[in-house]
């Protein structure tokens, strides 16, 4: 399968427009709003967990959210929603967000795992490097509020709402 | 590989009620919505409803309301279809279908033929 | 509910015959178009989906095409296993529907 999105009138909340495939964009239709971490399967006639497809070759319409998915269930790595990206937090300690605190007090305390650069900043040398500096302070983190990717915990996220068209 | 296997043939009374089943292997069953499509002999197919063995979630076709539920048993990776009060327009084969969520049903049961008969 | 319409219900053709089977849309369905094949007491099985794409293991001389409300199935050279029974179904909108059929008969 080749991932066509199904979401072009779908309607997540706060869906990635640009996640779409070009013949996603679907304008016939009126959009259905799902609650966030869903997604709306029109033929299905209702709203699904995007967890149910994050391991199939579908899961453009979910492409977001499965990728914090993924990236949540790797150590020492947190998705920014902001960039979309699954940031390692080994290349940002130091100036790290709280999903990374973990991470980063734990590398601190032993030097030796550090990178050199992170090495030096620990003993006082301060690399300037201006593109950087900064970068992570100011975003909204909302990856610290998902939760584990754990069936049947969180039920508002995981049950399919029954949307009756 | 995919494969769906239907329970087999049954031959039941006005009035009665059947239960096919429809067991899966080679993917992760629980994630997959499976749909059921009922063939009257010698005509097309028609969509009766799906059901989403992740959460048990159902959707029935409104002519199939009241007549069909659809349920799963995620321990044998299995659904099941049962239509209640039967009549001679419930003979067909009742096909188990997987969905694809492109809008397709890309594996199917090998289809139970039902047949009602005084 | 979304009408299918496929013509012609049924058609003769002998083996090398390029054949043509169309499917028309009550209403815009997009390229959310899925062809079947059915073959006598067997389960149908998907051949194509959204409008051309050949489901695996699908031979090359099916095609499709189309878009909106009118698609095509073409088999361009007929072999002895295409005789059948052809469905579309369109794969857009709640509740998923399907095409009356066209069969495919040896002349």
């Known amino acids: 399968m080749s991932g066509l999105g199904r979401s072009r009138r779908g309607g997540r909340s706060r869906v990635d427009q640009e996640e779409r495939f070009p013949q996603g964009l679907w304008t016939g239709v009126a959009m259905r709003s799902c609650p966030e971490e869903q997604y709306w399967d029109p033929l299905l006639g209702t709203c699904m967990s995007c967890k149910t497809i994050c391991n199939h070759q579908s899961q453009r319409t979910c492409a977001a959210f499965c990728r914090s998915l993924s990236c949540r269930k790797e150590q020492g790595k947190f998705y920014d929603h902001l960039l979309r990206d699954c940031i390692s937090c080994a290349s940002i300690c130091g100036q790290h967000p709280k999903q990374c605190a973990y991470f980063c007090e734990n590398k601190l305390r032993s030097p030796v795992n550090l990178p050199p650069e992170l090495r030096r900043q620990r003993s006082g040398e301060v690399e300037n490097n201006s593109d950087n500096s900064g970068r992570y302070q100011g975003l909204e983190h909302r990856g610290s509020e998902a939760s584990p990717a754990l069936p049947g915990l969180k039920l508002s996220a995981d049950q399919v709402a029954l949307v009756y068209s | 590989q995919v494969q769906l296997v239907q329970s087999g043939a049954e031959v039941k009374k006005p009035g009665a009620s059947v239960k096919v089943s429809c067991k899966a292997s080679g993917y992760t069953f629980r994630n997959y919505v499976m749909h059921w499509v009922k063939q009257k002999p010698g005509q097309g197919l028609e969509w009766m409803g799906w059901?989403?063995?992740?959460?048990?979630?159902?959707k029935y076709a409104q002519k199939f309301q009241g007549k069909v539920t659809m349920t799963s048993d995620k321990s044998t990776s299995t659904v099941y279809m049962e239509l209640s009060s039967l009549t001679s327009e419930d003979t067909a084969v009742y096909y188990c279908?997987?969905?694809?969520?492109?809008?397709?049903?890309?594996?199917w049961g090998q289809g139970t033929l039902v047949t009602v008969s005084s | 509910d979304i009408q299918m319409t496929q013509s012609p219900s049924s058609l003769s053709a002998s083996v090398g015959d390029r054949v043509t089977i169309t499917c028309r849309a009550s209403q815009d369905i997009s390229n959310y178009l899925n062809w079947y094949q059915q073959k006598p007491g067997k389960a149908p099985k998907l051949l194509m989906r959204?409008?051309?794409l050949l489901h695996s293991g699908v031979p090359s001389r099916f095609s499709g095409s189309g878009s909106g409300t009118d698609f095509t199935l073409t088999i361009s050279s007929l072999e002895q296993e295409d005789f059948a029974t052809y469905y579309c179904q369109q794969g857009n909108t709640f509740p998923p529907t399907f095409g009356g059929g066209t069969k495919v008969e040896i002349k």
């Open positions: 279908a997987r969905y694809d969520y492109e809008g397709s049903f890309d594996y």
């Open positions: 959204y409008t051309s």
């Open positions: 059901i989403l063995p992740y959460n048990d979630g159902t």
